[in-house]
Amino acid sequence: SVRVEQVVKPPQNKTESENTSDKPKRKKKGGKNGKNRRNRKKKNPCNAEFQNFCIHGECKYIEHLEAVTCKCQQEYFGERCGEKSMK
């Protein structure tokens, strides 16, 4: 079954015009390593106030949801990948 995780909304401290762009800055899914992506004007909260948010995992900013989530390392789970599975 599909697990829908919690996401955390970063505080809104920018104006809409400062934040708006044409393309997201998440990783390209095709096989081109994202080299055709343009430079981004927006700041990724994962590099700022959420840089230490994911304890045992990688912080990901989801632009569509204006929220951060964690991609946990193996054996870890939870909103911040702070819990270890007992396997």
Epitope: V4, E5, Q12, S21, K60, H64, L65, T69, C72
Partner: antibody, heavy 125, light 112 residues
Amino acid sequence: EVQLQESGGGLVKPGGSLKLSCAASGFTFNSYAMSWVRQTPEKRLEWVATISTGGSHTYYPDSVKGRFTISRDNAKNTLYLQMSSLRSEDTAMYYCARHGYLLYDGYYEWYFDVWGAGTTVTVSS
Amino acid sequence: DIVLTQSPASLAVSLGQRATISCKASQSVDYDGHSFLNWYQQKPGQPPKLLIYAASNLESGLPARFSGSGSGTDFTLNIHPVEEEDAATYYCQQSTEDPPYTFGGGTKLEIK
């Protein structure tokens, strides 16, 4: 019941402007990204614009960039599309659509899970 | 931009038989084993309706005769057994992270 209802379509001359609205009901509007998708007279589907949950991020294809502006009013549960410098090739049925999504293991997968009935835009002199 | 090519453009299938629709992407729509491709059904005078998301997940409430498969650049929508109400046009759509979010050209299914 989850519903989207578009309005504002009509006949407009080339170079003219039009503003479409989409009223949402039956779900928590500010929890979903939203898009406009159009269908040409040849029945081709074309993505037109997307806006994030709070309106901070907007996305457009090159064909409408600089001419169309997507916006939302979460207090009114309404999505908008301001269209200017309209061209004959913008003639289409315009749908608003909700981005359903899966979020798991750090992955975000989305799809258009709810569509409105559409509003017709005709650009002709 | 990722181009999605559907084939055939139209097909006629006998009641109770299998309909197979192909969608080929100009580059991979996979990332880390996840396929970012969706299928929609559209009947005349109606908006498109979500059928399959993430390549193989059937939208809730829809009959199990619809199934999706594939990965990378090659995807397939199967309908079996086909019923009268399945007469419609079917579209694939990719939802990778970088816009534009493109659709295939559509496949019109006729029931014989």
